[in-house]
Interface confidence: medium
């Protein structure tokens, strides 16, 4: 979480910004909150990005101004209109590129004063895992699969039965680039599968942490799974 | 008893959507998945997915995802399956049912007919 | 996916014939369950895995198999056994069945 107030005490304002990650293709949200304002013609948002002469966004007089847009940004960007007189001058970023990585600032202006924070923003590919039996397997063995990751992660396997158990000898990852030349396919098989266990397979970067569980009794599986992003802090 | 309630049958257009639902009574509905199977006319059984009631967690035949959506109201012991985007080889009977244990509990089945 | 190959898909038997229905998956399941369905009723549970027989059904019917191959019995058929006959798998995603075998009479 960042906070951020205005130069002059008097006239400053707070700013809370949320380090957050973006996964490439996708859609994504910059987090920003301030003190609301009781008349939406005062506010003025302004994102910036370090390193990128124009504006990211601009939001002012309760409408979009991006004559100042920089060209990377063209067509990307949307406040919620609807949500900045309570506070909310968050960011959604369509079709996030690699390139869009980096610290992003704030800054808002409203009849009370100014403020600003400033964001981290990471970009790479994260997906859900999906753990089934692999049944082209002679023994059984279980496969771990998720369609997009970059960086490349790590995979990890864990059982609840052999808790602190090392399966690397036991398993074998690999990473299949995607058609885009960008983003990998992951895919992990685990060996020597004993039944009435829960395993999970762990794969994770710097930007997220994801878990595919898998119960394997006698007569059937069942799965889930989960994603949590790593750099969600706030400012 | 242990009981699943089906809504009644449905006429729908190509296109469209339908929300089926399964009332649950007699146990913890929080305690048992709860799956949707459908049944074309003259056909085999079919398994459309898998819902955890007591987080609402999912498990999906890749063939429904993205069309089929599981949700439950724990407050009213209720599952739902939603299927958009119909076309004429969605006619069929839809089930719910418990998940397995010595004893099997199933819907009485709702007819979707879609028809233009 | 895991296909289910029964066989035979139809057969004609009298009251008191032995009935056996084979149900062969592409892959190793370990397991096997099966469903009896009768006209306009929802599937009703008989075995469960593989050889367990399901709560109120009676002992005429059994089930034995292991890997891919798994067999449905009866062992003495009855009137009301008049149906059509399912093997169901729940270890492989997606969850699936067999074609379905029709017991009528002959």
């Known amino acids: 979480l960042i906070i951020g107030f205005g130069i002059s005490g008097r006239h400053s304002i707070t700013v809370t910004t949320v380090a957050s990650a973006g996964n490439i293709g996708e859609d994504g949200i910059l987090s920003c909150t301030f003190e609301p304002d009781i008349k939406l013609s005062d506010i003025v948002i302004q994102w910036l990005k370090e390193g990128v002469l124009g504006l990211v966004h601009e939001f002012k007089e309760g409408k979009d101004e991006l004559s100042e847009q920089d060209e990377m940004f063209r067509g990307r960007t949307a406040v919620f209109a609807d949500q900045v007189i309570v506070g909310n001058a968050s960011l959604r970023l369509k079709n996030v590129q690699l390139t869009d990585a980096g610290t992003y600032k704030c800054y808002i202006i409203t009849s009370k004063g100014k403020g600003n924070a400033n964001l981290e923003y990471k970009t790479g590919a994260f997906s859900m895992p999906e753990v089934n039996v692999d049944y082209n397997a002679s023994s059984e063995t279980l496969r771990c699969e998720a369609p997009r990751w970059f960086p490349q992660p790590t995979v990890v396997w864990a059982s609840q039965v052999d808790q602190g158990a090392n399966f690397s000898e036991v398993s074998n990852t690999s990473f299949e680039l995607n058609s885009e030349n960008v983003t990998m396919k992951v895919v992990s098989v685990l060996y020597n599968v004993t039944i009435n266990n829960t395993y999970s397979c762990m794969i994770e970067n710097d930007i997220a942490k994801a878990t595919g569980d898998i119960k394997v009794t006698e007569s059937e599986i069942k799965r889930r799974s989960h994603l949590q992003l790593l750099n969600s802090k706030a400012s | 008893e242990v009981q699943l309630v089906q809504s009644g049958a449905e006429v729908k257009k190509p296109g469209a959507s339908v929300k089926v639902s399964c009332k649950a009574s007699g146990y913890t509905f929080t305690n048992f998945w709860i799956h949707w199977v459908r049944q074309a006319p003259g056909q085999g059984l079919e398994w459309i997915g898998e819902i955890d009631p007591s987080d609402s967690y999912t498990n999906y035949n890749q063939k429904f995802k993205g069309r089929a959506t599981l949700t439950v109201d724990t407050s009213t012991s209720t599952a739902y399956l939603e299927l958009s985007s119909l076309r004429s080889e969605d006619t069929a009977v839809y089930y719910c049912s418990r998940e397995i244990t010595t004893v099997d509990y199933w819907g009485q089945g709702t007819l979707v007919t879609v028809s233009s | 996916d895991i296909q289910m190959t029964q066989s035979p898909s139809s057969l004609s038997a009298s009251v008191g014939d032995r009935v056996t229905i084979t149900c062969s998956a592409t892959?190793?399941?370990?397991?096997m369950h099966w469903y009896q369905q009768k006209p306009g009723k929802a599937p009703k549970g008989l075995i469960y895995?593989?050889?367990k027989l399901a709560h109120g059904v009676p002992s005429r019917f059994s089930g034995s198999g292991s890997g891919t191959d798994f067999t449905l019995t009866i062992s003495s058929l009855q009137p009301e056994d008049f149906a059509t006959y399912y093997c169901?798998?729940?270890?492989?995603?997606?969850?699936?069945f067999g074609q379905g075998t029709k017991v009528e009479i002959k």
């Open positions: 169901h798998q729940r270890r492989s995603y997606p969850f699936t």
């Open positions: 892959s190793s399941i370990s397991y």
């Open positions: 895995d593989t050889s």
